[in-house]
Interface confidence: low
C-alpha cells in the first residue's frame, strides 16, 4: 500500500506516534516519506547482507527476522514480512522500540539527513487529524 501523506499522518496518530518519545507527528511522516516514499512494501538491501523493510525501513540485522540475515537479533520479535503489511501496526510498534533505544530518531538515516532540523510540521499541514 502507498499511503497518502495525510492518510499516513492520521494512521500514525491513531497508533500513538504523535509526540512519542518527544517526536512530533511531522517527524514520523517526514521519515516515512524519505525512507519509503510512503510505501509499506518498500525493501532495500544493505551492503552487510541485511535488508530494510516497510514504510519506516526497519532493519533485519537488529529488529526483525527475515530468516536470511546472519546474526539477526530480532529485537522487535517479529517476522520482517509483517512490516510489509498495509496495516502499519507492526511497523509502528517496532518503531516505538527503536526510538526508545537511546539514539531516538537518529536511528533513521533519512530522518537525520532530510528531516532533522527542518520544518517537519509541513508534513501534516492541512491534514484533518
Amino acid at each position: 500500500k502507498v499511503f497518502g501523506r495525510c492518510e499516513l499522518a492520521a494512521a500514525m496518530k491513531r497508533h500513538g506516534l504523535d509526540n512519542y518519545r518527544g517526536y512530533s507527528l511531522g517527524n514520523w511522516v517526514c521519515a516515512a516519506k524519505f525512507e519509503s516514499n510512503f510505501n509499506t512494501q518498500a525493501t532495500n538491501r544493505n551492503t552487510d547482507g541485511s535488508t530494510d523493510y516497510g514504510i519506516l525501513q526497519i532493519n533485519s540485522r537488529w529488529w526483525c527476522n527475515d530468516g536470511r540475515t546472519p546474526g539477526s537479533r530480532n529485537l522487535c520479535n517479529i517476522p520482517c514480512s509483517a512490516l510489509l503489511s498495509s496495516d502499519i501496526t507492526a511497523s509502528v510498534n517496532c518503531a516505538k522500540k527503536i526510538v526508545s533505544d537511546g539514539n531516538g530518531m537518529n536511528a533513521w538515516v533519512a530522518w537525520r539527513n532530510r528531516c532533522k532540523g527542518t520544518d517537519v510540521q509541513a508534513w501534516i499541514r492541512g491534514c484533518r487529524l
Partner: antibody, heavy 115, light 107 residues
Framework: QVQLQESGAEVMKPGASVKISCKAT????????IEWVKQRPGHGLEWIGE????????YYNEKFKGKATFTADTSSNTAYMQLSSLTSEDSAVYYC?????????WGQGTTLTVS | DIELTQSPATLSVTPGDSVSLSCRAS??????LHWYQQKPHESPRLLIK???QSMSGIPSRFSGSGSGTDFTLSINSVETEDFGMYFC?????????FGGGTKLEIK
C-alpha cells in the same frame, strides 16, 4: 498447503527468449521472496536470484544479470522469469522456490531445451 | 562468493549402514547451512535447516551438525528410499550457493 506450480517444458531456438511462470498458492504471496534456481547435469544447483512480489524488489546473481529478468503479478499470485538471448548453456531445469533463507517449498521444475 | 565443497562425490553403501556426508565452506558461515535430498526427476527436498534443525516429516535418522566451515549430514541406518543426491546450501551471504552434491548409491 503451500504449493508452487511451474509452467511446462519449453524447446527454444538459440537467440530467442522464454518466460517461465511459477504460480503460488497456500500462503501470502506478496510477503515471501521467490527464488529461482538453475540445474544442469554435472553443474549442480545455481542460484539465479530472487524477487519479493509485493514490492517488486529483485536481486540477481551477478552471473545471471542481463540473462534473467524477474517479474511478479500479485493479482494472479504468479512470479515470472524471462531468459533472453538463449544459448545451449541455458538448457537446464529451472526451479522456483519460496525463500526463507532455506528453501522449504519448490516448484516441480521447468525443463528448457535450447537447440 | 562462498564456495561449498561436498565430499565424497559418491558414496556406495549397503542398507542398514550409517553414513556421514561432508560440506566444507570456503569461509565461515556460522550455522547458516541447509541440506537437501534430490531423487532423479524430482525437486530438491529440504531435510535440515540451519545446520541441525530437522524439518517436520523428515525421518529421525537424518541429523546435521557442524559450525563455521565444516558441516556434516548423518544418516543413521540408511534405508533404500534414502538413495539419491544430497546438496548443501548456504544462506550466510549473497549470492546463495550450493555444494556440488554427494550421490548416495547402493553398493
Amino acid at each position: 498447503q503451500v504449493q508452487l506450480q511451474e509452467s511446462g517444458a519449453e524447446v527454444m531456438k538459440p537467440g530467442a527468449s522464454v518466460k517461465i511462470s511459477c504460480k503460488a498458492t497456500g500462503y501470502t504471496f506478496t510477503t515471501y521472496w521467490i527464488e529461482w534456481v538453475k540445474q544442469r547435469p554435472g553443474h549442480g544447483l545455481e542460484w539465479i536470484g530472487e524477487i519479493l512480489p509485493g514490492s517488486g524488489s529483485t536481486y540477481y546473481n551477478e552471473k545471471f544479470k542481463g540473462k534473467a529478468t524477474f517479474t511478479a503479478d500479485t493479482s494472479s499470485n504468479t512470479a515470472y522469469m524471462q531468459l533472453s538471448s538463449l544459448t545451449s548453456e541455458d538448457s537446464a531445469v529451472y526451479y522456483c522456490a519460496r525463500g526463507d533463507g532455506w528453501y522449504g517449498y519448490w516448484g516441480q521444475g521447468t525443463t528448457l531445451t535450447v537447440s | 562468493d562462498i564456495e561449498l565443497t561436498q565430499s565424497p562425490a559418491t558414496l556406495s553403501v549397503t542398507p542398514g549402514d550409517s553414513v556421514s556426508l561432508s560440506c566444507r565452506a570456503s569461509q565461515s558461515i556460522s550455522n547458516n547451512l541447509h541440506w537437501y535430498q534430490q531423487k532423479p526427476h524430482e525437486s530438491p527436498r529440504l531435510l535440515i535447516k540451519y545446520t541441525s534443525q530437522s524439518m517436520s516429516g523428515i525421518p529421525s535418522r537424518f541429523s546435521g551438525s557442524g559450525s563455521g566451515t565444516d558441516f556434516t549430514l548423518s544418516i543413521n541406518s540408511v534405508e533404500t528410499e534414502d538413495f539419491g543426491m544430497y546438496f548443501c546450501q548456504q544462506s550466510n551471504s549473497w549470492p546463495r550457493t550450493f555444494g556440488g552434491g554427494t550421490k548416495l548409491e547402493i553398493k
